[in-house]
């Protein structure tokens, strides 16, 4: 039978001779050279050679366990003379013994990692991993221990896991953002003689909101013309924040100051500036300087950092209002004046006043905008603003005159303003009442006395305060012996009544009645109107049947016998 055990061979042999592996030996071998040993399998004849007489095996080359840890070969022993095996062919193993010839190698040459600034001590940053090709099952050749070569006191590494953690309290990104940490991985459990490898870990502190906004100056001054409309930007202020991104966002607000109601501050989200704007109309003549207290604050802070103090700062903003040459200002937004329609030319109606609001108080001159008074009915004293008539008025033609008066600074004609003037023409009784329409009526031949044949209405262009009160009567020249009477109804109407029984159209076909209409105002106005009454044949119901044709073309005027 074969007489050997498993062969062990140290890797990386550096001797000048071949490395002895071991001896194949059969108990049939009497040492007389009658047996021949043959080797086959992994590396036989190349890596491994055998002395066919003695069975001694040698390795011809340096072996690397990490390349191949085990070789499987077959051994034969044959009788030289007969060529027959004296032992059955048998498999055997050459196991390569590990030596510590490999250093730990990190999975990355360079690691990058981030950790928030101000993190608690022991905050996880990143885990590094090194692997060692040596045999982990034998000795400590592959037992890796991590240590920090560079990066203390800021960071530490767990020796067994390679977990890097923060090691220093209150690491501040604003002081230092980048750290280069060098980690060593050493085998042999870190003992002397162990092999080592290193890696670089580039650690960046990420920003947290640990800094408040700060104004670079305590006072700002801006100027703005008093004419600036609401919404006008008048200046920009900017607080700076050592943080970045979201943590450097700033909101601005006005917290105090006499200009609290007069100005606004808007946050420009692009530039993180505060834009001071006009909120209400300014007036240099009322107030020339405003002060504001403006606050810049971070809108968001992680509550755990609130202990670092108020995340806001304030500055004083002084705003100087600049005088602007303003147009004159009238004492009223509009003027309403009244004048009687019978006013003589050059009658003063009233006056307007305008003043230059500026400190200079420039004198003003007045004029009428002729586009609004084409007929030049009114005029104005350019010096004192008195309005007077330059033509006669008629209320019945135009009740209201709407004109525009212009006030212009004498020293600066570009500065002018306008005001509407509403002039009401007051009524004077200068129109007589008259018939509301042309009256032409008829009377039946068989009419009875005191029969109403027509109701009369009157109109008057005037507009008396207490209303119209008309009176009606027959003209004096027609009153005596008239065939008709006028009955005044005392309600601004009158009736024409028959005065006799029966009329004869052959005797008198047409009557012309002159009627006097008077008003009750001062001075009394009256007019005479003529009513034409034709005599007609009627049926028994009083319906007209026929009248003389000439009555239709009879000239108006006074007729005898009416």
């Amino acid at each position: 039978s074969w007489m050997w055990n498993q062969f062990f061979l140290l890797e990386e042999y550096t001797g000048s001779d071949y490395q002895y592996v071991g001896k194949l030996h059969s108990d049939q071998d009497r040492g007389d050279g009658s047996l021949k040993y043959i080797l086959s399998g992994d590396g036989a004849g190349d890596l491994f050679i055998i002395n066919e007489n003695t069975g001694d095996i040698q390795a011809t080359k340096r072996l690397d366990r990490e390349e191949k840890p085990v070789y499987i070969l077959r051994a034969q022993a044959i009788n030289r003379r007969t060529g027959r095996p004296v032992e059955p062919e048998s498999e055997f193993i050459i196991k390569i013994h590990d030596i510590n010839d490999n250093e730990p190698i990190f999975t990355k040459e360079v690691y990058t990692a981030t950790v928030p600034e101000m993190s608690d001590v022991g905050t996880f940053v990143v885990q590094v991993t090194a692997t060692d090709a040596d045999d982990p099952t034998y000795g400590n050749s592959a037992k890796v221990v991590y240590s920090i070569l560079q990066g203390q006191p800021y960071f530490s590494v767990e020796s067994e896991t390679g977990i890097i953690k923060t090691a220093l309290l209150n690491m501040d990104r604003e002081n230092r953002e980048q750290y280069q940490v060098v980690i060593q991985a050493k085998d042999m459990g870190g003992q002397m003689g162990g092999l080592s490898g290193t890696t670089t870990v580039n650690i960046t502190l990420t920003d947290v909101n640990d800094n408040p906004p700060r104004f670079p100056q305590s006072t700002y001054q801006f100027k703005t013309p008093e004419s600036s409309p609401p919404g006008t930007p008048i200046g920009r202020i900017k607080a700076s924040d050592a943080d970045v991104g979201e943590n450097a966002e700033i909101e601005y607000s006005i917290t105090d100051g006499e200009g609290l109601d007069m100005f606004d501050v808007i946050t420009d989200q692009e530039t993180q500036e505060g834009i001071i704007t006009v909120k209400k109309l300014l007036d240099f003549e009322k107030k020339k300087v405003y002060t504001l207290k403006v606050e810049a604050s971070n809108p968001y802070v992680e509550p755990r950092f609130l202990y670092l103090g108020p995340f806001k700062d304030s500055a004083t903003v002084r705003i100087v209002v600049e005088d602007v040459d303003e147009p004159p200002v009238f004492s009223k937004l509009a003027y309403i004046l009244q004048i009687r329609e019978d006013a003589q030319i050059n009658t003063t109606i009233g006056s307007v006043t305008a003043q230059d609001p500026d400190a200079a108080r420039n004198p003003v001159k007045y004029s009428v905008d002729r586009h609004t008074d084409m007929d030049r009915i009114f005029n104005i004293d350019s010096g004192n603003g008195s309005i007077f008539t330059s033509k006669l008025l008629d209320r019945e033609t135009l009740l209201w005159h709407n004109i525009t008066v212009i006030a212009t600074e004498i020293n600066n004609p570009k500065q002018s303003s306008r005001v509407p003037l509403y002039i009401k023409v007051l009524d004077v009784n200068d129109n007589a009442p008259e018939f509301a329409e042309f009256y032409e009526t008829f009377v039946c031949e068989k009419a009875k006395a005191d029969q109403l044949i027509q109701t009369l209405h009157a109109v008057d262009k005037d507009d008396p305060y207490s209303g119209h009160q008309f009176s009606f009567s027959l003209a004096p020249e027609a009153a005596s012996g008239s065939n008709f009477t006028i009955q005044d109804n005392k309600d601004n109407t009158a009736g024409i009544l028959t005065r006799k029984n029966g009329y004869n159209r052959h005797e008198m076909s047409t009557y012309l009645l002159p009627v006097v209409i008077s008003d009750n105002d001062y001075p009394v106005q009256s007019s005479t109107g003529t009513v034409t009454v034709r005599v007609c044949a009627c049926d028994h119901h009083g319906n007209m049947q026929s009248c003389h044709a000439e009555a239709l073309i009879h000239p108006t005027g006074l007729s005898t016998g009416a």
Partner: antibody
């Protein structure tokens, strides 16, 4: 009252990018903070990140390397992109508004109804 | 990260009863805690912020208490519409973290 509505594909292939939109009505996204939160099967919730009223972003460190939140103020929308997704990203995704409750703190006070996303091949 | 632990995870109660839900945190978060409610088919609703301040529109039967690491949501005299999922969230530090929730069901 503000309303939020998520939209996007319900199925995403592994290793691809997940993209969701959030449309906001009756409120401008140029005020307050606008974020994304997800709920995994089993009810575990995770804050993913937000975009501020002026466009700055803040992300959960666990997602920092593959998340992006952007916005389109003209459309009053904001967006989530999550790259290199795996089955572990299967969740219901919610867009939300955070308002300032004083003391520098922002609290989620309005949520969208949620969009269910499955990562599967 | 701040760990949030809810208890119980499931709770059954009848209308009219009072219930309390607990939320514990792994570190002191002062009072920077909110409570949310979710009812099936509805969006999440903010109930309480700053540990105990009721959000506008939250009925007065809800109350929040606690500070530091131990917080409680109490609902007095349950109404039928109160059943659903409740969970807490801290906003003391980033990343903001949530509890896994308590499911409140009708007994």
């Amino acid at each position: 009252e503000v309303q939020l509505q998520e939209s996007g594909p319900g199925l995403v292939r592994p290793s691809q990018s997940l993209s969701l939109s959030c449309s906001v009505t009756d409120y401008s996204i140029t005020s307050n903070y606008w974020g994304w939160i997800r709920r995994f099967p089993g009810n575990k919730m995770e804050w993913m990140g937000y975009i501020t009223y002026s466009g700055y972003t803040s992300y959960n460190p666990s997602l920092q390397s593959r998340i992006s939140i952007t916005r389109d103020t003209s459309k009053n929308q904001f967006f989530l992109q999550l790259n290199s997704v795996t089955a572990e990203d299967t969740a219901t995704y919610y867009c939300a508004r955070s308002i300032n409750h004083g003391g520098y703190s922002y609290v989620v006070d309005a949520w969208g109804p949620g969009a269910s996303v499955t990562v599967s091949s | 990260d701040v760990q949030m632990t809810h208890s119980p995870s499931y709770l059954a109660a009848s209308p009219g009863e009072s219930v309390s839900i607990s939320c514990k945190t792994s570190k002191n978060i002062s009072n920077y805690l909110v409570w949310y409610q979710q009812k099936p088919g509805e969006a999440y609703k903010l109930l309480i912020y700053s540990g105990s301040t009721l959000q506008s529109g939250t009925p007065s039967r809800f109350s929040g208490s606690g500070s530091g690491t131990d917080f409680t949501l109490t609902i007095r005299s349950l109404e039928p519409e109160d059943f659903g999922l409740y969970f807490c969230q801290q906003y003391y530090e980033k990343p903001f973290t949530f509890g896994s929730g308590t499911k409140l069901e009708i007994k």
